[in-house]
């Protein structure tokens, strides 16, 4: 079983939309406004980022054996992320890139949540740690971290899709 | 600075086929996507579709599947649209645009005329 | 797809008013709207980006409000250069979309 309900994802488009979100997240990066990166300094700040690791049943044999544990985390770390892409740290000052594709980032994360997610089901979703940076450096030190960590994250899910994709659809 | 130069002005058949390119400068071509944009005489702009150099990821308005293809040349920066099955419908002016989801940069447009 | 209302179609106005102009979107799109000006036979022009932030070198006169699914652009004090054609453009995913414009032209 694979989503609430026990119906399969449509691995297929999962796989399409998450190979977007890769170049989106990729193209995304240098565009969050400028930053010295010397300032890059404490990672606790993004500690609390989702990461998808081996006990989340994500290898090939977890997939065919309960893909439901994998696609959960997957649909926490989308929501987890699309939240952030919402909140002040990406509207605030300073303003993104005219170029940035932070907007075409957050629809298809929010897309492939609700592929992964029909309405009337729930998931738990993980807790948004309360990250609100007072200065507008620390907004850039965050994007450019958050933008990091999504990457890794979303090119995870692509290989997952990829997958189930390849084996595991009907 | 940042320049898109689009190809010239075309008169083509009914029928027939043709290719617009849109050549990039001042900046990594490899790392900002190439939107295309129609707007027909007196009308607003519609969304063809984009390409993202770096890897060659397309998406195309479901409107323009199977009318328009997308492509990219990194070698030389530049980005192509062919256009299929021409008809007096596809008479409008095509641009070329940079950007994430707002297009900041634009090509100058090419006029495309269908008459036979 | 989302679609994009704007109004009016078009306006009539003299150098020195204020004039505004509004668009609805027909779902949420956040703050990821554009407002661009178009001159006849010319390129659009991007003025403002994620329904507030003005892009480089467009004259503070113009500023953009808005978010969710209602937007506004405002003139302050018209002047001759900006008689053209507006549109607004939702950047929350694709297909992306414009209004169908609104042709200010001196009155």
């Known amino acids: 079983r694979a989503v609430p309900g026990g119906s399969s994802p449509a691995w297929t488009q999962c796989q399409q939309l998450s190979q977007k979100l890769c170049t989106l997240a990729w193209s995304a990066h240098p565009l969050v406004g400028h930053m010295d990166l010397r300032e890059e300094g404490d990672e606790e700040t993004t500690n609390d980022v989702p990461h998808i690791q081996c006990g989340d049943g994500c290898d090939p044999q977890g997939l065919r054996d309960n893909s439901q544990f994998c696609l959960q985390r997957i649909h926490q770390g989308l929501i987890f992320y699309e939240k952030l892409l919402g909140s002040d740290i990406f509207t605030g000052e300073p303003s993104l890139l005219p170029d940035s594709p932070v907007g075409q980032l957050h629809a298809s994360l929010l897309g492939l949540s609700q592929l992964l997610q029909p309405e009337g089901h729930h998931w738990e979703t993980q807790q948004i740690p309360s990250l609100s940076p007072s200065q507008p450096w620390q907004r850039l030190l965050l994007r450019f971290k958050i933008l990091r960590s999504l990457q890794a994250f979303v090119a995870v899910a692509a290989r997952v899709f990829a997958h189930g994709a390849a084996t595991l659809s009907p | 600075q940042v320049q898109l130069q689009q190809s010239g002005l075309e008169l083509v058949k009914p029928g027939s086929s043709l290719k617009i390119s849109c050549k990039a400068s001042?900046?990594?071509?490899?790392?900002?996507?190439i939107h295309w944009l129609k707007q027909r005489p007196g009308q607003g702009l519609e969304w063809i579709g984009w390409?993202?150099?770096?890897?060659?990821?397309?998406e195309y308005n479901e409107k323009f599947k199977g009318k328009a293809t997308l492509t990219a040349d990194t070698s030389s920066s530049t980005a192509d649209m062919h256009l299929s099955s021409l008809t007096s419908e596809d008479s409008a002016v095509y641009f070329c645009?940079?950007?994430?989801?707002?297009?900041?940069?634009w090509g100058q447009g090419t006029l495309v005329t269908v008459s036979a | 797809d989302i679609q994009m209302t704007q109004s009016p179609v078009s306006l009539s106005a003299s150098v020195g008013e204020t004039v505004t102009i509004t668009c609805r979107a027909s779902?949420?799109?956040?703050?990821?709207l554009a407002w661009y000006q178009q001159k006849q036979g010319k390129s659009p022009q991007l003025l403002v980006y994620?329904?507030?932030t003005l892009a480089e070198g467009v004259p503070s006169r113009f500023s953009g409000s808005g978010s969710g699914t209602q937007f506004s652009l405002k003139i302050n004090s018209l002047q001759p250069e900006d008689f053209g054609s507006y549109y607004c453009?939702?950047?929350?995913?694709?297909?992306?979309?414009f209004g169908a414009g609104t042709k200010l032209d001196l009155k």
């Open positions: 994620n329904a507030k």
């Open positions: 645009a940079r950007g994430g989801g707002n297009l900041p940069y």
């Open positions: 779902e949420n799109v956040y703050s990821y």
């Open positions: 001042g900046y990594s071509f490899t790392s900002f996507f």
């Open positions: 390409i993202f150099p770096g890897n060659h990821d397309v």
């Open positions: 453009q939702h950047h929350f995913g694709t297909p992306l979309t």
